[in-house]
Interface confidence: low
């Protein structure tokens, strides 16, 4: 004789009782009414199960909550099922058996039917696990039921001080969706908040789980697929104040079935977004966007932000959204890079794009901008990187495309190619009024517009000029004069550890900033506009340094241990970290600080010039770094502002030294023999290069490196030309937000 092997199968669900009404008392687990009604309801549930063939497998059950509508009972029950039958008793099958029983007019009228009129239609049965019940039970000392009426924003009461776990059980009108807003009120905590697309904490219905006070998402809004949601909080460390605020509302289902007709132009024409963007998309999201293109000359480009698409085998679910584009199945995934999906047009009836959430786990709302591109020339003057759909500079010495194809088959790399014989001349010799090419092609078209390319400067009117680095050189090269606008910059006022450096004089580096917390120098920075200082994002990676309120910015400073009349200090009103910054890789290591009031420029305080995206800093060029960093590896910060000259290093040489961990957003400078370098405390400080015009341009920001001044290991800087679009975007959008 062999004992039959059974497995415990847990089911969770809800049922509606038509002849009972919900009362406030039933919403409180500690009330007498709750205890009495839950005991009766549990008996009813037990009898209901016992009346079916599931009765023989019954183990235990619990009615753990009540809700509106007229009275909804939320429950779980466990069946001990023979192993061989486990797969046959799915939640759908169990529901069917229970519904059949509710609809049957059996002669022996079960006692549960006399007292409870259960609505068969409203029966919900979901798969659960023993662990789900454990989690649920751990919250019962702090269980909060709330019914969310339409139109109201309901703030949810924070957790009780003495409890370690709470559950907010949220329910709204059946035809609406629950939307929860979670706002972290502190920057450091170890609390965990999980949201479920069900009345209880069912792992299989998890929408999202956040741990600690999320700096990436200080405020998040999360949608359920329908009118119920459970939010579970687990305490991290003791705190007198709640580290978060919760509120909830019931919102209407938003349609995302759109037909759009694009116009025959190449700029961005609009965006597609998941309902309630930037809220998390709902587990029930299904969007269908049909875009019609004016002619087959064009292809359609979808521009994603921190989200990309890739092919996925059909038998694998997409965990971050499924996309169907022209019958191709793609899976979305979050990434800290830009991405474009290019859709070549083969038929004139346009393209249908479907976005579907395949699982309950969702993520931040997705927004995609759309535009057209010329199918015959998708990237005028640039290279189309097929890996990520982006147009990147070609043959500039930097492998922008992950496969490096933008730097293959180059006749002249980071140089000008003469038309006559394909000889290469250095870029500063182009349009310098000295013919260097055989027939002088380097000096042609210098006074007129040329097709845009990697090294051409784009004027404000979108035309391009051939002369490299024409900004602020005292000559108007653009028809609209835009190359000579915003030129109140880059002039020295007078006349980190900076390893191998020398002391600076007053006004020599008037853009240099000292970023301090409680009187202690932490990082360097550079003034780029009257309310903006640029620095490195990694200066803020510690939770304890993430708040702008902590920081003071000093400009015009010379010595750390004393103040002098030429220096001024500012509080920081806002802090912007590059959205793609990644701590581990140091990529996109840039941040912007908005000062609390405008800077008054003087001989000792004025901004450095920002380079255009096309600005070329030539490898081999001597530039300067400045800061109060340590003067030897592991040493203390310097008292006096130090300066040191460093040489710009070709990208491939640096990439080799650092085993290919150098991204296109990085620039290297230093010397093979080491010695001269930045060090701890110089982070975020400026690497500046002087143009022939005498103006200083910001080439880089001190970012990372192996040690300080070590032979064969150059200093690595954030390459400003590769993040300049983001810088301009922030300055433009927030210059008025005082």
């Amino acid at each position: 004789y062999k004992a039959e092997v059974t497995v415990s199968q847990v089911y969770s669900g809800s049922l509606r009782v038509l002849n009972r009404h919900f009362s406030q008392d039933l919403g409180r687990r500690e009330s007498i009414a709750f205890r009495s009604e839950s005991a009766k309801a549990q008996k009813m549930l037990q009898e209901l199960v016992a009346s079916t063939r599931l009765g023989t497998y019954y183990n235990s059950s619990s009615v753990y909550s009540f809700g509106e509508g007229p009275l909804t009972c939320f429950f779980w029950f466990i069946l001990d099922i023979p192993e061989y039958q486990r797969l046959t008793l799915s939640p759908e099958v169990v529901r069917e058996l229970l519904v059949d029983e509710l609809l049957s007019n059996s002669s022996t009228l079960a006692s549960y039917k006399t007292e409870y009129e259960v609505d068969p239609e409203g029966l919900v049965i979901l798969e659960a696990s023993v662990n789900d019940i454990v989690v649920l039970n751990s919250t019962l000392g702090c269980y909060r039921y709330s019914y969310v009426n339409p139109g109201q924003v309901l703030p949810l009461k924070g957790p009780d001080q003495q409890t370690t776990s709470c559950l907010w059980h949220l329910q709204g009108p059946e035809d609406l969706m629950i939307k929860v807003r979670l706002e972290w009120t502190r920057v450091d905590c170890r609390d965990r908040v999980a949201m479920y697309d069900a009345a209880g904490p069912l792992e299989k219905r998890l929408i999202t789980s956040v741990y600690g006070c999320s700096r990436q998402e200080p405020v998040m809004e999360v949608l359920a697929s329908g009118s119920v949601m459970a939010v579970v909080w687990k305490k991290g460390m003791h705190s007198y104040y709640d580290p978060f605020l919760l509120s909830v509302k019931s919102v209407a289902f938003q349609d995302c079935q759109v037909n759009l007709t694009l116009e025959g132009r190449l700029d961005t024409q609009g965006f597609l977004r998941t309902p309630y963007y930037p809220s998390y998309y709902s587990p029930s999201t299904h969007c269908s966007w049909h875009l019609t293109v004016p002619s087959l000359d064009y292809g359609l480009a979808l521009w994603f932000d921190a989200y990309a698409l890739r092919r996925q085998k059909y038998n694998r679910l997409c965990t971050q959204g499924q996309w169907m584009i022209q019958n191709r199945r793609l899976c979305g995934f979050r990434t800290l890079q830009p991405y474009a999906e290019r859709i070549p047009m083969v038929a004139s009836d346009g393209v249908t794009i479907n976005f579907t959430s395949q699982i309950s786990l969702t993520g931040p709302g997705v927004q995609v901008y759309y535009s057209l591109y010329n199918q015959s020339d998708p990237c005028p003057g640039e290279f189309l990187c097929s890996v990520n759909g982006l147009c990147v500079p070609a043959c500039d010495g930097i492998k922008d495309c992950p496969n490096g194809l933008d730097e293959r088959n180059c006749v002249c790399r980071a140089m000008f190619q003469c038309q006559e014989d394909s000889t290469c001349i250095s870029l500063p010799r182009v349009c310098d009024r000295q013919p260097d090419c055989l027939n002088g092609s380097d000096e042609e078209q210098c006074q007129e517009g040329v097709p845009c390319g990697t090294f051409t400067f784009q004027c404000e009117d979108r035309s391009c000029v051939k002369k490299p680095n024409p900004e602020c050189d005292g000559q108007s090269d653009c028809r609209d004069g835009s190359d000579e606008q915003h030129c109140d910059c880059g002039l020295q006022g007078l006349s980190s550890r900076i390893v191998g450096g020398t002391v600076s004089s007053e006004g020599e580096w008037p853009w240099q900033a000292s970023l301090q917390i409680r009187g202690r120098h932490i990082c360097g920075g550079a003034l780029i506009a009257d309310r903006w200082v640029i620095t490195a994002a990694h200066c803020f990676q510690e939770d304890s340094m993430a708040s702008p309120k902590l920081w003071t910015v000093f400009l015009g400073k010379m010595r750390q241990n004393s103040r002098w009349p030429g220096e001024v200090s500012f509080k920081v009103s806002r802090l912007f970290l590059h959205p793609y910054h990644e701590e581990d890789s140091h990529d996109y290591d840039v941040a912007l600080l908005q000062l609390d009031h405008p800077v008054v420029y003087s001989a000792t305080v004025r901004p450095v010039c920002l380079p255009a995206r096309s600005h070329f800093f030539e490898p081999g060029q001597h530039c300067w770094i400045t800061g109060w960093g340590a003067q030897r590896e592991g040493g203390p910060v310097s008292n006096t502002l130090q300066k040191v000259d460093v040489q710009l290093v070709p990208q491939d040489l640096c990439s080799e030294a650092y085993r290919y961990q150098v991204s296109p957003r990085m620039l290297c400078a230093g010397y093979r023999k080491g010695k001269k370098d930045a060090c701890q405390g110089d982070s975020g400080g400026p690497l500046v290069c002087r143009e022939p015009s005498g103006r200083w341009f910001l080439a880089g920001l001190v970012s990372w490196g192996l040690g300080c001044g070590r032979p064969n290991f150059f200093g690595v800087y954030t390459r400003v030309t590769r993040v300049i679009n983001w810088i301009q975007q922030v300055l433009t959008h927030h210059h008025h937000h005082h």
């Epitope: 509120s247 961005t268 609009g270 965006f271 433009t732 959008h733 210059h735 008025h736 005082h738």
Partner: antibody, heavy 118, light 107 residues
Framework: QVQLVQSGAEVKKPGASVKVSCKAS????????MHWVRQAPGQRLEWMGR????????TYSPKFQGRVTIIPDTSANTAYMELSSLRSEDTAVYYC???????????WGQGTLVTVSS | DIQMTQSPKSLSASVGDRVTITCRAS??????LAWYQQKPGQSPKLLIY???TRHSGVPSRFSGSGSGTDFTLTISSLQPEDFATYYC?????????FGQGTKLEIK
């Protein structure tokens, strides 16, 4: 549903100040920017300024800087606009409106007529 | 400040007509442009924002186009309730500025 209800019409003498209130319902003002826009008889709309009630950060039009003050009362879900040193050319209908971040003003109050005359 | 110029200042049209109103910005405002409708004695109502996006509840006969400095509001088939004054507004940078308005009257 979203509603912005403004205080009633005012008659003021030149040099005086006026304070107009804007009570919001159907949404939380802390989630939005609150703007004030005015329209003199037969004239175009003129943006005066805005506030982010979450942190009381204000941005004013240079034309009104120094004369206008916008303040929130988040507990009452209300925004206020005070205009000082009134002159006859300040006679206008004053509107409050809300916006999300960089989007324009999607819902407006019914307007408050302020008449300045001696 | 960014100047906004609308044309025409006024226009007469009949029910069923297709009407176009243009708005020009004195500098590039990308696609940060909104259109409002205002009837006498009423507050403005948002029709279009980000140059082309219809506000919820706005009939599909209203459409917006343009980017940079030149923008257009089109009403494909005029209805009796569309006779009003229309304003454009740049929401690109503060101070936000409005056009002088286009009064649409019944012919």
């Amino acid at each position: 549903q979203v509603q912005l209800v403004q205080s009633g019409a005012e008659v003021k003498k030149p040099g005086a100040s006026v304070k107009v209130s804007c009570k919001a319902s159907g949404f939380n003002i802390e989630d939005y920017y609150m703007h004030w826009v005015r329209q003199a008889p037969g004239q175009r709309l003129e943006w005066m300024g805005r506030i982010d009630p979450e942190d009381a950060e204000t941005t004013y039009s240079p034309k009104f800087q120094g004369r206008v003050t916008i303040i929130p009362d988040t507990s009452a879900n209300t925004a206020y606009m005070e205009l000082s040193s009134l002159r006859s050319e300040d006679t206008a209908v004053y509107y409050c409106a809300r916006s999300i971040y960089l989007d324009p003003m999607d819902y407006w109050g019914q307007g408050t007529l302020v008449t300045v005359s001696s | 400040d960014i100047q906004m110029t609308q044309s025409p200042k006024s226009l007469s049209a009949s029910v069923g007509d297709r009407v176009t109103i243009t708005c020009r910005a004195s500098q590039d405002v990308t696609t940060a442009l909104a259109w409002y409708q205002q009837k006498p004695g009423q507050s403005p109502k948002l029709l279009i924002y980000w140059a082309t996006t219809r506000h919820s509840g706005v009939p599909s006969r209203f459409s917006g186009s343009g980017s940079g400095t030149d923008f257009t509001l089109t009403i494909s088939s005029l209805q009796p309730e569309d006779f009003a004054t229309y304003y454009c507004q740049q929401h690109y940078s503060t101070p936000y500025t409005f056009g002088q308005g286009t009064k649409l009257e019944i012919k």
